[in-house]
């Protein structure tokens, strides 16, 4: 009866809109409802625009499907025509009263069926049952594997591939691990698997900076150092590097008015010339202060060096040298003097001799023909020359003597003249000013060091070479070498250092072979008023430390590896160093800083003297050590 | 014994030129500086010029710079000074004094501490129209 | 150029006095000072050298003190033959500059 009806209502539509054309009143006869004349009459007011009298305007255009005026018309009322639903997504389409019902394929959803369900974010099935990865695809889904893995017959499974299996040289010299989905290349740890040369090789770890200052990168690892010359040390972590610290504080203050004569190792301090009225007589007038036993304390000369005076000191005692064209003499006589207390000394040309006074009691009278200095042009002119000779004298001496001196003067009155001209001039530079309080020993400030050549070789000793040290040592810091053999290769064959302990406030001794620690003394309070004292015997086959202390040692094995090493450097040339290394190699050894305290050296029954040294950094203080920081109430 | 003599002096009208000499004995010129100093009637010393040892070097005060000219000849042991275009303010007692460096010191750097410690009794230019 | 100011311009003092004359530089002139003693128609003598030193054969109570701009010559003692006219003047650079003088007269 439906499709009767609908067959009427096209006869009627032909006959009323398409043979005659109808308004709406017309059209609604035919549709008996207004639903469907609502939905008809603007689109068969469309239709009549595209096809009358041939006018193709923007309206027709949506008409083209349509070869004539009546198949535009007659498809109207067809909901389904043309197609509202999506193709891809609709099974059918059924007409309705100026609507239209889509009926959608599976997988898909929506009035026209316009959307695609995503199974994989179903949450009644959660990733669409898949156990990998869900791939949502138009109106269905599938599931798929990483990478590594193959999908089971279930579809929706996956399993690990063993890569290391199926291809044995997957990773040429390296380990292949089969990891889940992967595999992985391994190598040893400080190494770096290469794809194209599929093999191992080393990572530069200093390249990625890794360390805070110095780095060594070596076959599967690093070190890093620190610059122990500039005052630092490496921190726990390895990597970083911290201050060498103070852990015993020195009265370091300084005074202008005191001239140290130690300044330069090898050279004159202070040069005076006097031109002086001819009625004018040689007179040095000073307070003097040294531990020293040897050294120039003044050389005065004339002009054309053809007459000298000598002040010096020898056996801790003044000793007087003079050379003139009427007299060569030498004289010591009076106290010892190198007690470390102020003793004013005053040399003065009388008229026939020359008075030596100690805390103004007579203590020499050198007899003497003629003036001293032969005055020229109306003036007296006199050279007067400071803890050391202008240049090579000693032939012209009468005695020779080692001019190193580490002494202080204060008060000098030369010529009479007073310090005038001359103190000002000190106080300027800093260096040259003396400490205000010292003890007796040698100071390594922490910037540098002494050289010694020493033959250890002992021909009635059947071991051959043997190294017999004992150390007296109060360190003002806690990391330092304080005594180190260095072979013309320059290696580091034996070192005696110390380094700040793990545990709070003490340090370790350490020795070495090289950069291997052979032997730690641990966990010593050393930064204390009182001096520590170490004492040990080296020679080819062992090394034994005569201080009873808690040792940690390396194996016996490893023991003697090590000595065998020190043995084939002592067969060479080796240079011995003081307070810390020259220029090697700053992985030479554990430690490079520069050792910082007081410290006394005596090797195989010899006490060594800074003075005698080859070279010594000008900053040592050979016989003068600051005395340790008294807090005062203000400080 | 040590000193110097001066000579030259005399009087001389506006725009004219004298020269004075300094002859020393009792040592060699040639290890020392000399200067010229004057002393105006009732006036304090007025350093005129100086000149080094071997005449490398001269110095004037600035009234003076242009006209006066310091000159030495160590072979004669004398000073000169050649004053042209005298005005009446250069009317003085001029000294020759030797500049000695009495004390030296090297200590990083020379410092030399000078002072005039010969002097001759002078000698008097006049300069009046 | 360095300028010298002495003062006073004159003093009058006893034997046996003790008298300072002060000497002031317009800038630093470390030490480099030097006093001379000038008697009515002689040449000036020098006293001392470098601030503080004393030239052989003066006798020792004359001294100098100071440094940098401030200068002293001080007479311990004054002896009839020290009435003079006193002199500083600087050698620490060209042109050499002396001060204006003081003189010493019997009281």
């Known amino acids: 009866a439906n499709s009767m009806l609908e067959e009427t209502k096209q006869g009627n539509l032909e006959r009323e809109c398409i043979e005659e054309l109808c308004n709406k009143e017309e059209a609604r006869e035919v549709f008996e409802n207004d639903p469907e004349t609502d939905y008809f009459y603007p689109k068969y007011l469309v239709c009549l625009r595209s096809f009358q009298s041939g006018l193709f305007t923007a309206a027709r255009q949506s008409t083209d499907a349509y070869p004539d005026l009546r198949s535009c018309v007659n498809a109207i009322p067809d909901q389904c025509s043309p197609l509202p639903c999506n193709e891809d997504g609709y099974m059918s389409c059924k007409d309705g009263k100026a609507s239209f019902t889509c009926t959608c394929k599976p997988g898909w959803q929506g009035e026209k069926c316009e959307f695609d369900i995503n199974e994989c974010k179903d949450p009644s099935n959660i990733n669409g049952g898949c156990s990998q990865i869900c791939d949502n695809t138009p109106g269905s889904y599938h599931c798929s594997c990483k990478s590594g893995f193959v999908m089971l017959s279930n579809k929706k499974d996956c399993k690990d591939v063993d890569e290391c299996s199926l291809k044995p040289n997957m990773c040429g010299t390296a380990v292949c691990k089969n990891i889940p989905g992967d595999f992985e290349c391994e190598c040893p740890e400080g190494y770096r698997y290469n794809l194209k040369s599929k093999s191992c090789e080393d990572v530069d770890e200093c390249s990625e900076n890794m360390c805070a200052q110095l780095c060594v990168n070596y076959p599967g690892g690093y070190t890093c150092y620190c610059d122990g010359k500039k005052g630092f040390k490496l921190a726990q972590d390895q990597k970083s590097c911290e201050a060498v610290s103070v852990c015993l504080p020195l009265n370091l203050d300084t005074k202008y008015e005191l001239l140290y004569l130690a300044e330069q190792f090898a050279g004159v301090v202070l040069y005076l010339k006097f031109r002086l009225p001819e009625i004018s007589r040689f007179s040095a007038e000073f307070d003097f202060r040294t531990y020293d036993s040897q050294g120039v304390i003044l050389y005065a000369e004339s002009i054309d060096h053809s007459a000298w005076l000598l002040i010096a000191l020898r056996g801790g005692k003044i000793e007087v040298q003079l050379k003139n064209e009427h007299t060569s003499k030498i004289t010591t006589g009076g106290d010892i003097i190198n007690n470390g207390l102020w003793n004013m000394v005053s040399v003065e040309e009388l008229e026939h001799s020359i008075s030596i006074k100690i805390a103004k009691e007579a203590v020499m009278d050198i007899n003497k023909p003629g003036p001293l200095f032969k005055p020229e042009n109306g003036l007296l002119e006199t050279k007067v020359y400071f803890a050391g000779f202008p240049r090579k004298v000693e032939s012209e001496l009468i005695k020779p003597i080692n001019p190193r001196l580490d002494g202080c003067i204060r008060s000098w009155n030369l010529m009479k003249q007073g310090a005038s001209g001359i103190k000002e001039i000190i106080q300027e530079k800093q260096n040259k000013h003396c400490l205000v309080t010292v003890e007796k020993g040698s100071y390594y400030p922490g910037s540098g060091i002494a050289e010694f050549h020493i033959d250890y070789n002992n021909g009635s000793n059947a071991e051959g070479w043997h190294i017999n040290v004992t150390l007296n040592i109060r360190p003002s810091m806690g990391t330092g070498v304080m005594l180190a053999l260095v072979s013309s290769n320059n290696t580091v064959p034996f070192a005696v250092s110390l380094v700040d302990s793990t545990s709070e406030k003490s340090q370790d001794i350490v020795i070495s072979v090289e950069n291997t620690v052979i032997y730690r003394i641990q966990a010593l309070s050393l930064c204390s008023n009182q001096r520590s004292h170490l004492e040990f015997r080296v020679n080819r086959n062992n090394l034994e430390l005569l201080t009873p202390l808690k040792i940690e040692t390396i194996s016996q094995e490893e023991l003697q590896t090590q000595l065998a090493i020190l043995d084939k450097a002592m067969k060479g040339k080796v240079a011995t160093y003081l307070g810390g290394l020259p220029d090697v190699p700053f992985s030479a050894t554990p430690v490079n800083a520069f050792y910082n305290g007081c410290m006394e050296v005596n090797i195989n029954g010899v006490e060594l003297d800074l003075d005698e040294a080859i070279s010594k950094h000008n900053d040592i203080r050979a016989h003068s050590c600051p005395s340790v920081w008294k807090k005062t109430k203000n400080s | 014994e040590v000193q110097v003599v001066e000579s030259g002096g005399g009087l001389v009208q506006p725009g004219g030129s004298l020269r004075l000499s300094c002859a020393a004995s009792g040592f060699t010129l040639n290890s020392f500086w000399m200067s010229w100093v004057r002393q105006a009637p009732g006036k304090g010393l007025e350093w005129v010029a100086n000149?080094?040892?071997?005449?490398?070097?001269?110095y004037y005060v600035d009234s003076v710079k242009g006209r006066f000219t310091i000159s030495r000849d160590n072979a004669k042991n004398s000073l000169y000074l050649q004053m042209n275009g005298l005005r009446a303010e250069d009317t003085a007692l001029y000294y020759c004094?030797?500049?000695?460096?009495?004390?030296?010191?090297?200590?990083?750097?020379?410092?030399?501490?000078?002072?005039?410690?010969?002097w001759g009794q002078g000698t008097t230019v006049t300069v009046s129209a | 150029d360095i300028q010298m100011t002495q003062s006073p311009s004159s003093l009058s003092a006893s034997v046996r006095d003790r008298v300072t004359i002060n000497c002031r530089a317009s800038?630093?002139?470390?030490?480099?000072l030097n006093w001379y003693q000038q008697k009515p128609g002689k040449a000036p003598k020098l006293l001392i050298y470098?601030?503080?030193s004393l030239q052989g054969g003066v006798p020792s109570r004359f001294s100098g003190s100071g440094s940098g701009t401030d200068f002293t010559l001080t007479i311990s003692s004054l002896q009839p033959e020290d009435f003079a006219t006193y002199y500083c003047?600087?050698?620490?650079?060209?042109?050499?500059?002396f001060g204006q003088g003081t003189k010493v007269e019997i009281k």
């Open positions: 003047q600087q050698s620490y650079s060209t042109p050499r500059t």
């Open positions: 004094a030797r500049e000695t460096d009495i004390l030296t010191a090297y200590y990083s750097d020379y410092y030399s501490y000078y002072g005039m410690d010969v």
């Open positions: 470098a601030a503080s």
């Open positions: 000149i080094k040892e071997d005449g490398s070097e001269k």
């Open positions: 800038q630093s002139i470390r030490s480099y």
